[in-house]
């Protein structure tokens, strides 16, 4: 079942999924000047059987100017840098990932993919949070969020993480104003809900190798 809302936004933090639950969908988005091939699926889908999970469908981009061709276009220098970064992330990601039953790994990059990855998560998915460079974590519990379903409505649990600047005093600063709880879910259950965009994930090479080799920026 698809999560019809988003993981909470934590100030000065990014989140990532270590692995993607079966049922997760990834939009086949192409960079500017390119489009998905006409016969191509709009999504990649994490599917599997009892022993193995993998991504169904392959995203393919073609030049918007070209007609029904997947001819490779020589990228501009900035595009090459972009692609190299993504390839590097993907290689690093494999070393960082665990093989969880019923989960898919980060899909490898495809030619001329967009700089953002838009994932559609499913109930039961866990995402993990980490403070961005220059901020340190004050934990009051697990720095993770899980998509749960109650009475047919989906919600993400609130990660117990606050990111404080290195120069700030070591006390819990005021948190962001919480979102109002959806009707029918007690405040204690929801803590805070953010139900806005899908998971627009911008990939960057992490400055640190400590926790996440491959970070994801919440848009």
């Amino acid at each position: 079942e698809l999560c019809d809302d988003d993981p909470p936004k934590i100030t000065h933090a990014t989140f990532k999924a270590v692995a993607y639950k079966e049922g997760t969908m990834l939009n086949c988005e192409c960079k500017r000047g390119f489009r998905r091939i006409k016969s191509g699926s709009p999504y990649m889908l994490c599917t599997g059987n009892s022993s193995h999970s993998s991504w169904d469908n392959q995203c393919q981009c073609t030049s918007s100017a070209a007609r029904n061709t997947t001819k490779q276009v020589t990228p501009q220098p900035e595009e090459q840098k972009e692609r190299k970064t993504t390839e590097m992330q993907s290689q690093m990601q494999l070393a960082d990932q665990v093989s969880l039953p019923g989960h898919c790994r980060e899909p490898p990059p495809w030619e001329n993919e967009a700089t953002e990855r838009i994932y559609h998560f499913v109930v039961g998915q866990t995402v993990y949070y980490q403070c961005v460079q220059g901020y340190r974590a004050l934990h009051r519990g697990p720095a993770e969020s899980v998509c749960k379903m109650t009475h047919g409505k989906t919600r993400w649990t609130q990660p117990q993480l606050i990111c404080t600047g290195e120069t700030e005093p070591s006390q819990f600063p005021g948190e962001e104003e919480p979102q109002a709880s959806p009707d029918g879910l007690p405040e204690s259950e929801t803590s805070r809900l953010v139900t806005t965009t899908d998971f627009r994930i911008q990939t960057e090479v992490a400055a640190t190798m400590e926790t996440f080799i491959f970070t994801t920026e919440y848009q």
Epitope: P42, Y43, T154, T196
Partner: antibody, heavy 116, light 106 residues
Framework: QVQLVQSGAEVKKPGSSVKVSCKAS????????MHWVRQAPGQGLEWMGY????????EYNQKFKDKATITADESTNTAYMELSSLRSEDTAVYYC?????????WGQGTLVTVSS | DIQMTQSPSTLSASVGDRVTITCSAS?????MHWYQQKPGKAPKLLIY???NLASGVPARFSGSGSGTEFTLTISSLQPDDFATYYC?????????FGQGTKVEVK
């Protein structure tokens, strides 16, 4: 109480556009996606897409990607769906429905009739 | 896309009858949801996550099933139950509905 109130019926010429509105009240507008569902006369329900009001992110059924544009105005708690290049087969009732999981609240529907 | 096939398309029944509507999905899904619609009105949530009754829905309605086969049952049809019923999946995009089952007076 939660309410979704849609704009009134429209009669449009082929080739023109129409913008249907859906005003939400009784809940935090930005905390739920707004979905749109179409029902042609005597036919079933078809999901068209949704918008996440706070960010403006949209996801469409590929069938309607070139037909519909979904937007939202946080300041008025209103979601919109614009239909372009109207044809007779776009004649239908268009519903907005609150997301966040199952569609627990629906607008009353807006009948769009395309006729020359 | 996941196709949803409801049967029958039309069902003629009398008050007090036990009514069963089935919905088959073209691929396995996690849950089925059911909506009721009356002429000129918006659909109304009836059953969510396969077997849970929405708020205010009478206990004569029940849902069951798993994988690709799901069922909506009305144990004793009441006058207010004559309507069209739709199954719905939200396990994958695009979200899809069955074509509907019209329950009419025999």
């Amino acid at each position: 109480q939660v309410q979704l109130v849609q704009s009134g019926a429209e009669v449009k010429k082929p080739g023109s556009s129409v913008k249907v509105s859906c005003k939400a009240s009784g809940y935090t507008f930005t905390s739920y996606r707004m979905h749109w569902v179409r029902q042609a006369p005597g036919q079933g329900l078809e999901w068209m897409g949704y918008i996440s009001p706070r960010k403006g992110y949209t996801e469409y059924n590929q069938k309607f990607k070139d037909k519909a544009t979904i937007t939202a105005d946080e300041s008025t708690n209103t979601a919109y769906m614009e239909l372009s290049s109207l044809r007779s087969e776009d004649t239908a009732v268009y519903y907005c429905a609150r997301g966040g999981g199952v569609f627990d609240y629906w607008g009353q529907g807006t009948l769009v009739t395309v006729s020359s | 896309d996941i196709q949803m096939t409801q049967s029958p398309s039309t069902l003629s029944a009398s008050v007090g009858d036990r009514v069963t509507i089935t919905c088959s999905a073209s691929s396995s899904i996690s849950y089925m949801h059911w909506y009721q619609q009356k002429p000129g009105k918006a659909p109304k949530l009836l059953i969510y996550t396969t077997s849970n009754l929405a708020s205010g829905v009478p206990a004569r309605f029940s849902g069951s099933g798993s994988g690709t086969e799901f069922t909506l049952t009305i144990s004793s049809l009441q006058p207010d139950d004559f309507a069209t019923y739709y199954c719905h999946q939200r396990s994958t995009y695009p979200l899809t509905f069955g074509q509907g089952t019209k329950v009419e007076v025999k």
